[in-house]
């Protein structure tokens, strides 16, 4: 009974450094508490971008200083990452854990490659 997690293969961040994607999981059980973590993989290094635990039917709440925001609807989480710059280009992996009730399930997506292009500075006007 593995849990499958789906996410888009590629997303292009906006010129304001904002990227959004959907993380969808096929729940093997009736979870009431879910944890979603976004991991960034670049050059074989893995770092946690953000994480949130939420109760099904409630809003997804990240920490105040998080660069992530999100909403949940059923087995679908809409994630937005802001403040991105070109150096943040990389593979962003959605990790979903069904925390409660037992049994626990882990699901890891294949990752979304987020491309970030820094905007060209506006040329000085004469």
């Amino acid at each position: 009974k593995a849990m499958h997690v789906a996410q888009p293969a590629v997303v292009l961040a906006s010129s304001r450094g904002i990227a959004s994607f959907v993380c969808e999981y096929a729940s093997p059980g009736k979870a009431t508490e879910v944890r979603v973590t976004v991991l960034r993989q670049a050059d074989s290094q893995v770092t946690e971008v953000c994480a949130a635990t939420y109760m099904m039917g409630n809003e997804l709440t990240f920490l105040d200083d998080s660069i992530c925001t999100g909403t949940s609807s059923g087995n679908q989480v809409n994630l937005t990452i802001q403040g991105l710059r070109a150096m943040d280009t990389g593979l962003y992996i959605c990790k979903v854990e069904l925390m409660y009730p037992p049994p626990y399930y882990l699901g890891i997506g294949n990752g979304t490659q987020i491309y970030v292009i820094d905007p060209e500075p506006c040329p000085d006007s004469d």
């Epitope: 093997p28 944890r35 893995v46 882990l106 890891i108």
Partner: antibody, heavy 118, light 108 residues
């Protein structure tokens, strides 16, 4: 560097209690699920318990449910295992382990020996 | 509970030879959630492979993992003296977390 160090093992009589500790360093402790795994002399590995992140969710192996309690103090970067009503079959080396980013147990402590004998 | 059965129980080989260890699950395990560990006498286990085929940090490329569904394999392409140890497979996709009983790789 990333490290886990267990302590608190020893020899105890059946029915008595013991508390194990696991001090973590080198990583953001609160961002990881933490497990206890044990190994009886000459035997294989047996998962014992896990505690998640802020500590509100805990799971136990059937063999220890109702007798063992896992807890954590994120301010002290420390994991605990309170073992009550100990039995001879609880004799083992107890390891704490980190559930890594991908879920596998990527960091292990050196282990602490618990012997339950009269 | 997912039961993992490892075979053989003991593998007697010489340095330089190829070792093939098997792990069979009682029900399907997603390859994303199957790990292999190495344990030497008096030491803690060490993560070798996660996600069935991804090498953990610092693990030499002579170690490789493969498989899906219920059948998984750990291969050591050329045994080095330090590779003689006990190897465990583990599933971590759902609770309870379970290990195989281990395969001992010993010097022939």
């Amino acid at each position: 560097q990333v490290q886990l160090v267990e302590s608190g093992g020893g020899v105890v009589q059946p029915g008595r209690s013991l508390r194990l500790s696991c001090a973590a360093s080198g990583f953001t402790f609160s961002s990881y699920g933490m497990h206890w795994v044990r190994q009886a002399p000459g035997k294989g590995l047996e998962w014992v318990a896990v505690i998640w992140y802020e500590g509100s969710n805990k799971y136990y192996a059937d063999s220890v449910k109702g007798r063992f309690t896992i807890s954590r103090d994120n301010s002290k970067n420390t994991l605990y295992l309170q073992m009550n009503s100990l039995r001879a079959e609880d004799t083992a080396v107890y390891y704490c382990a980190r559930g890594g980013d991908w879920g596998a147990f990527d960091i292990w402590g050196q282990g602490t020996m618990v012997t339950v004998s009269s | 509970e997912i039961v993992l059965t490892q075979s053989p129980g003991t593998l007697s080989l010489s340095p330089g030879e190829r070792a093939t260890l098997s792990c069979r699950a009682s029900q399907s395990v997603s390859s994303s959630y199957l790990a292999w560990y190495q344990q030497k006498p008096g030491q803690a286990p060490r993560l070798l492979i996660y996600g069935a085929s991804s090498r953990a940090t610092g693990i030499p490329d002579r170690f490789s993992g493969s498989g899906s569904g219920t059948d998984f394999t750990l291969t050591i392409s050329r045994l080095e003296p330090e590779d003689f140890a006990v190897y465990y497979c583990q599933q971590y996709g759902s609770s309870p977390w379970t290990f195989g009983q281990g395969t001992k790789v010993e010097i022939k």
